[in-house]
């Protein structure tokens, strides 16, 4: 399908935006309010969205002050950007079992940005490992 | 597609005022961050005034030349940006364009409306 | 405020050859390896459209004869073969912070 793998590449480029805009967050932590975030770690499988738009929902915040403002209000603003939907993603919003995103661990903004990047990668990496095994799931 | 019209142009006198507005359509507009730019006649373009989207708490902010006496707001469930304008001057003649901020760039623009100031 | 310098402020450019349009800001608008600076075209009688964002990113749907490029305060805007309808108004712009400036705009003519 021409379609279908054009939508997986949008996918793919739209996860490294992702991870160089988290990058670029992570240079304005002190520009950040020090407010503690459910970042998810050790996501399980097939609970990679539901982390995804846990850290997508979080309400992470530019502390409002200097020369920096619009730059990280932008880059936050990109961050909950929808990225185009997978097979996987459309079978994992159906799933119910798991973690609410209130029960996972609260961590500051530069942990909270590290375990975003960290999630962003294993998603990357499922994609990349599951179209080189010829499907078309994730 | 995306569009954007601006209406409440006119003739005014030094002094008076004007609400301008901003009709929006074909994209997500309670999301977006929406800018007024302003152009006067044979000259350059000038940003006036943002509000930011409803995820932001709607927060505002404007030029030095338009402060105290311009304010900007939106009604996201109208889909429509406003741009309220007292104690005009006549340096504040110009076409005003409603813009859309979309990360990085006003991407799209209406084509703007008439706001001239004389006596 | 962050004050860009446009030059030439005017052109005049036979079909078919190239183009180069400068733009100075008086203070850095680039960190951390972006550049907050973009270039729009104003068309006679038209609103502005956006040619190149972020410094060098062509805007979906602008022909690839617009680059750009630069860091830092110098930032150039290039037209590699110029075409009849890409006479107008260039106008640089930065979003570094705020307020939000542009630059006087540079007047591109046809010979």
């Known amino acids: 399908h021409k379609s279908s793998s054009q939508g997986q590449d949008r996918h793919m480029i739209r996860m490294r935006q992702l991870i160089d805009i988290v990058d670029q967050l992570k240079n304005y932590v002190n520009d950040l309010v020090p407010e503690f975030l459910p970042a998810p770690e050790d996501v399980e499988t097939n609970c990679e969205w539901s982390a995804f738009s846990c850290f997508q929902k979080a309400q992470l915040k530019s502390a409002n002050t200097g020369n920096n403002e619009r730059i990280i209000n932008v880059s936050i603003k990109k961050l909950k950007r929808k990225p185009p939907s997978t097979n996987a993603g459309r079978r994992q919003k159906h799933r119910l079992t798991c973690p609410s995103c209130d029960s996972y661990e609260k961590k500051p903004p530069k942990e909270f940005l590290e375990r975003f990047k960290s999630l962003l990668q294993k998603m990357i990496h499922q994609h990349l490992s599951s179209r080189t095994h010829g499907s078309e799931d994730s | 597609e995306v569009q954007l019209v601006e209406s409440g142009g006119g003739l005014v006198q030094p002094g008076g005022s004007l609400r301008l507005s901003c009709a929006a359509s074909g994209f997500t507009f309670s999301d977006a961050w929406m800018d007024w730019v302003r152009q006067a006649p044979g000259k350059g373009l000038e940003w006036v005034a943002e509000i930011r989207s409803e995820a932001d708490n709607h927060p505002t902010y404007y030029a030095e030349s338009v402060k105290g006496r311009f304010t900007i707001s939106r009604d996201d469930s109208k889909n429509s940006l406003y741009l309220q304008m007292n104690s005009l001057k006549t340096e504040d003649t110009a076409v005003y364009y409603c813009?859309?901020?979309?990360?990085?760039?006003?991407?799209?623009w209406g084509q703007g409306t008439l706001v001239t100031v004389s006596s | 405020d962050i004050v860009m310098t446009q030059t030439p402020l005017s052109l005049s450019v036979t079909p078919g050859q190239p183009a180069s349009i400068s733009c100075r800001a008086s203070k850095s608008v680039s960190t951390y390896g972006y550049s907050y600076m973009h270039w729009y075209l104003q068309k006679p009688g038209q609103p502005p459209q956006l040619l190149i964002y972020l410094a060098s990113n062509l805007e979906s749907g602008v022909p690839d004869r617009f680059s750009g490029s630069g860091s830092g305060t110098d930032f150039t805007l290039k037209i590699s073969r110029v075409e009849a309808e890409d006479v107008g108004v260039y106008y640089c712009?930065?979003?570094?912070?705020?307020?939000?400036?542009f630059g006087q705009g540079t007047k591109l003519e046809i010979k």
């Open positions: 712009q930065h979003s570094r912070e705020l307020p939000l400036t």
């Open positions: 813009t859309e901020y979309d990360y990085e760039g006003f991407v799209h």
